[in-house]
């Protein structure tokens, strides 16, 4: 019996009946065994077939078999109901070997020419399976020459049997207070040969509750408890299960904050598995009762571990822990069932006693001493000498706890001194130097510090004076002895003020003329305004209309009198403004250098002389009455003049204040 080629020889060739293409002889038996490499099969087809036809091919036949299985018994030339001829059919071995047997009996009624066949080895596609057969691989099958291999979808690993995909379903940890977990692929069938471990791990104090939901289908056995696939639930206290079958297990209240769920499957079966919805509970905290005028948020039926609530107060009420204010309040429920913070109160906002208003007073409008939310107070300034700046003085206690004006300001109103008030009324005629009476020149300031000089009070903490009068003290402000509220230069009864700082105009050059002869002294304390101490007004934009040539101004001071001594009593003189060109001309001739009189100066006095300010008056104010406001304002500052005060044809020269309003305002606002 010829054995045919064996692998690793090339596996292909031709087979033919003995004597082909001639007729075959009687009593012939020929057998061929063909062997292909592993993973290959043999393909065989006939190019010629002519054998004696007999019932069930009992006489002459060709038999194809693979292993123990007969693939075909062939005879005749064409197939009948009970006999088969190969025709154009191709035959395949079941494995890698194919046996071909040819037999002829003892006689033939007529000559038959036999058969010719060709064979070859070809790769088996193991991935193709017949309908109804189990698939080669669980997930993905990959064919290649001489074999195949299996692979798995993400989340699975190939079992050591090389065909089954086991789920990678261990190590999942659930830390939320509730959630869902299920068998892999649920509700589709769960994978075989898998071992899944799930952990629920909550904070200490929580207790996990397990509910099986929807459906439950785990392979079971009628007699033995869950021998194939099973689900087990383990806590630190006890074990539940194993579970299998088709009945939903009951709710499990674990009384534990940690749970381990184990699911093991074997190599067979087709079941949908299980789904668990888990929740948790804990010892509830006492129900939070909102304080009066407050509310709790969020509102819940109960509050357990980690739950929290906040307290919000109604408008006009504030959170307080005793006397201590809180912007917000949130309490958290602890594992022992207590809140981590005590309940605060919602107390009505109390703005507290309003601050005292310097030079003013406060009146309780809502009721005596009432300082709570929506209470109203009224600030007012001391009449006559002070006026309220910016607002109307009405303040309301608002929800933020601050007294707030109708304009929304939280700062106190300001009582600004009324300026330019004088007990004196001006006459229309010029008369000689006079003694001042109380209240005539309440802005008058006496400056002592090396020499005697004067100044004028601005607001309640500034003095306007001449730069030359305080130049020596510019670096030692505290050396200035500032007195006000008195008429007598040597009187012990005066209001004392001290200088905090001296500001000399940056354009002033000492001993080089008197241009920009202006300075400001900042007092270290505000002075109390009264009929004897009142600030002078600064000139309005329109003030020039009251300071034209021949308009009358008044100069006051304790300077030298005609007798050549400093005045004991405050003196004043009413003098007219002199035409600027006339004044400039008067000081053009020697000993005065050209340009002595600048645009920053104004002149006042009589052509005939006799009425003038003099040494010791320096820095004092030359004041004018604003007939529209009926207030006195400073038009000039006593600066310089002829060597002989009151000399005919010479005039007193004064710093022109209106030119310096921006400078004055800047200094005062900056400091």
């Amino acid at each position: 019996t010829p054995l045919g080629p064996k692998w690793p020889e090339p596996v292909f060739g031709r087979l033919a009946s003995p004597g082909f293409p001639g007729e075959y002889a009687n009593d012939q038996e020929r057998r061929w065994t063909l062997t292909a490499p592993p993973g290959y099969r043999l393909r065989l087809y006939f190019t010629h077939f002519d054998l004696e036809l007999s019932h069930l091919c009992e006489y002459d036949f060709v038999k194809l078999s693979s292993g123990a299985k007969v693939l075909a018994t062939l005879c005749g030339q064409e197939s009948t109901d009970t006999e088969r001829a190969p025709g154009k059919d191709t035959f395949y071995s079941l494995g890698s070997s194919l046996d071909i047997t040819f037999r002829s009996d003892y006689s033939n009624e007529k000559p038959f020419t036999g058969f010719e066949a060709f064979y070859a080895a070809e790769d088996i596609d193991e991935c193709q399976v017949a309908p109804g057969e189990a698939p080669t691989c669980d997930h993905h099958c990959h064919n290649h020459l001489g074999g195949f291999y299996c692979s798995c979808r993400a989340g699975y690993v190939l079992h050591r049997n090389k065909r089954t995909c086991s789920a990678l379903c261990s190590g999942q940890v659930f830390t939320q207070r509730s959630g869902e977990l299920s068998s892999p692929e649920y509700p589709r069938p769960y994978p075989k040969l898998s071992s899944c471990t799930y952990s629920i791990s909550l904070e200490e104090g929580f207790s996990v509750i397990l509910d099986f939901v929807e459906s439950f289908d785990v392979e079971t056995h009628p007699e033995t408890l869950c021998p194939y696939d099973f689900l087990k639930i383990q806590t630190d206290r006890e074990e539940h299960g194993p579970f299998c079958g088709k009945t939903l297990p009951h709710r499990i209240e674990t009384k534990s904050n940690t749970v381990t769920i184990t699911f093991v499957t074997d190599e067979s079966g087709d079941h949908t598995g299980w789904k668990i919805h888990y929740t948790s509970t804990a010892q509830p905290c006492p129900y939070p009762m909102a304080p009066p005028n407050g509310h709790v948020s969020p509102v819940q039926a109960k509050y357990i571990l980690k739950d929290s609530f906040s307290i919000f107060c109604e408008t006009g009420y504030e959170l307080l822990q005793g006397h201590l204010p809180l912007k917000s309040f949130t309490a958290v429920c602890q594992k022992d069932g207590s809140w981590d913070r005590p309940m605060p109160a919602c107390s009505i906002v109390d703005c507290g006693p309003p601050d005292d208003l310097p030079s003013g007073r406060v009146e309780y409008i809502t009721g005596p001493g009432v300082t709570t939310y929506k209470a109203v107070i009224q600030y007012s300034c001391e009449e006559t000498f002070y006026t309220m700046k910016v607002n109307d003085g009405k303040y309301v206690c608002e929800a933020d706890g601050f007294w707030t004006s109708s304009k929304g300001e939280k700062s106190l109103p300001v009582c600004e001194p009324v300026c330019g008030l004088s007990a004196r009324t001006t006459g229309g005629r010029i008369y000689g130097g006079q003694k001042a009476k109380p209240g005539d020149f309440p802005w008058q300031v006496l400056i002592l510090g090396g020499t005697t000089a004067a100044g004028a009070l601005l607001y309640d903490n500034w003095v306007l004076t001449a730069a030359h009068a305080v130049y020596e003290q510019k670096h030692d402000a505290s050396a200035l002895d500032i007195r006000m509220g008195t008429l007598k230069r040597l009187s012990p009864h005066y209001t004392q003020a001290w200088s905090e700082a001296v500001f000399i105009h940056e354009g002033y050059t000492h001993d080089a003329g008197f241009d920009n002869d202006i300075a400001l002294i900042k007092l270290n304390n505000k002075v109390v305004i009264n009929s004897n101490i009142t600030p002078i007004c600064l000139p309005r934009k329109e003030a020039e209309s009251f300071m034209r040539t021949d308009d009358i101004g008044t100069a006051s001071g304790w300077g030298l009198t005609q007798r050549g001594f400093l005045a004991r009593n405050l003196m004043y003189v009413d003098i007219p403004i002199v035409d600027h060109q006339k004044c400039t001309a008067a000081y053009e001739k020697p000993p005065y250098p050209r340009g002595s009189v600048t645009a920053n100066m104004l002149c006042a006095g009589l052509e005939s002389g006799g009425k003038d300010s003099c040494r010791g008056d320096s820095g004092g104010a030359l004041v004018f009455l604003d007939s529209e406001t009926e207030r006195w304002f400073v038009g000039g500052i006593v600066s310089w003049g002829s060597m002989n005060c009151g000399e005919a044809g010479q005039y007193g020269v004064y710093t022109k204040v209106i030119n310096y309003i921006p400078w004055i305002e800047n200094i005062i606002s900056d400091f």
Epitope: G322, H323, P325, L326, K327, P342, G352, D400, G401, F402
Partner: antibody, heavy 114, light 107 residues
Framework: EVQLQESGPGLVKPSQSLSLTCSVT?????????WNWIRQFPGNKLEWMGY???????SYNPSLKSRISITRDTSKNQFFLQLISVTTEDTATYYC???????WGQGTTLTVSS | DIVMTQSQKFISTSIGDRVSVTCKAS??????VAWFQQRPGQSPKPLIY???FRHSGVPDRFTGSGSGTDFTLTISNLQSEDLAEYVC?????????FGPGTKLELK
């Protein structure tokens, strides 16, 4: 972590003013709570001086009301104590503290002496 | 002003003892009382607030109780590091006031 740190002159002459600063890190003074000044006299007696709240409102010990001022600089997360007209009786260790005292500074010692 | 009285200036005790430090308010302060521990040269360390609430990080051997006018700080199983001065504070009303302190010392 919330931290408070006091700073000040250490020595002040009688009748002068005292200014102390409390610098806060790890928490904004406008977020919540009252921010207190507390002092401890020699002999360990503690005295609450006053607070400034998250909103800027102040509350003072009535015994100091005429001399005390508590202010703040929210941009620097600092609050300040000013005490005018000090006497030797104001010699103490000065602490700043939050809320009911859940956080304290380490204290700064002040001596009032001529 | 509310006066906080700590009647015992000193308490003599032993390691492992249970010690109670008391504080009495001159009028009702609700539960607005705090307790502090102070060692020489250190700032006060918060222990208890709102009479009964333990501050974070404070060992559970420290317990606060009381309300209204009578308050107690209890230290169970006293440790050597607990030997210090203990001061109460009421923060119910202005001005906030401290007790004079109670010092724990070894017998």
């Amino acid at each position: 972590e919330v931290q408070l740190q006091e700073s000040g002159p250490g020595l002040v002459k009688p009748s002068q003013s005292l200014s102390l600063t409390c610098s806060v890190t790890g928490y904004s003074i406008t977020s919540d709570y009252a921010w207190n000044w507390i002092r401890q006299f020699p002999g360990n007696k503690l005295e609450w001086m006053g607070y400034i709240s998250y909103s800027g409102r102040t509350s003072y010990n009535p015994s100091l009301k005429s001399r005390i001022s508590i202010t703040r600089d929210t941009s620097k997360n600092q609050f300040f104590l000013q005490l005018i007209s000090v006497t030797t009786e104001d010699t103490a260790t000065y602490y700043c503290a939050r809320y009911w005292g859940d956080y304290w500074g380490q204290g700064t010692t002040l001596t009032v002496s001529s | 002003d509310i006066v906080m009285t700590q009647s015992q200036k000193f308490i003599s005790t032993s390691i492992g003892d249970r010690v109670s430090v008391t504080c009495k308010a001159s009028q009702d302060v609700g539960g607005h009382v705090a307790w502090f521990q102070q060692r020489p040269g250190q700032s006060p360390k918060p222990l208890i607030y709102s009479a009964t609430f333990r501050h974070s990080g404070v060992p559970d051997r420290f317990t606060g109780s009381g309300s209204g006018t009578d308050f107690t700080l209890t230290i169970s199983n006293l440790q050597s590091e607990d030997l210090a001065e203990y001061v109460c504070l009421q923060y119910n009303s202005n001005p906030l006031t401290f007790g004079p302190g109670t010092k724990l010392e070894l017998k």
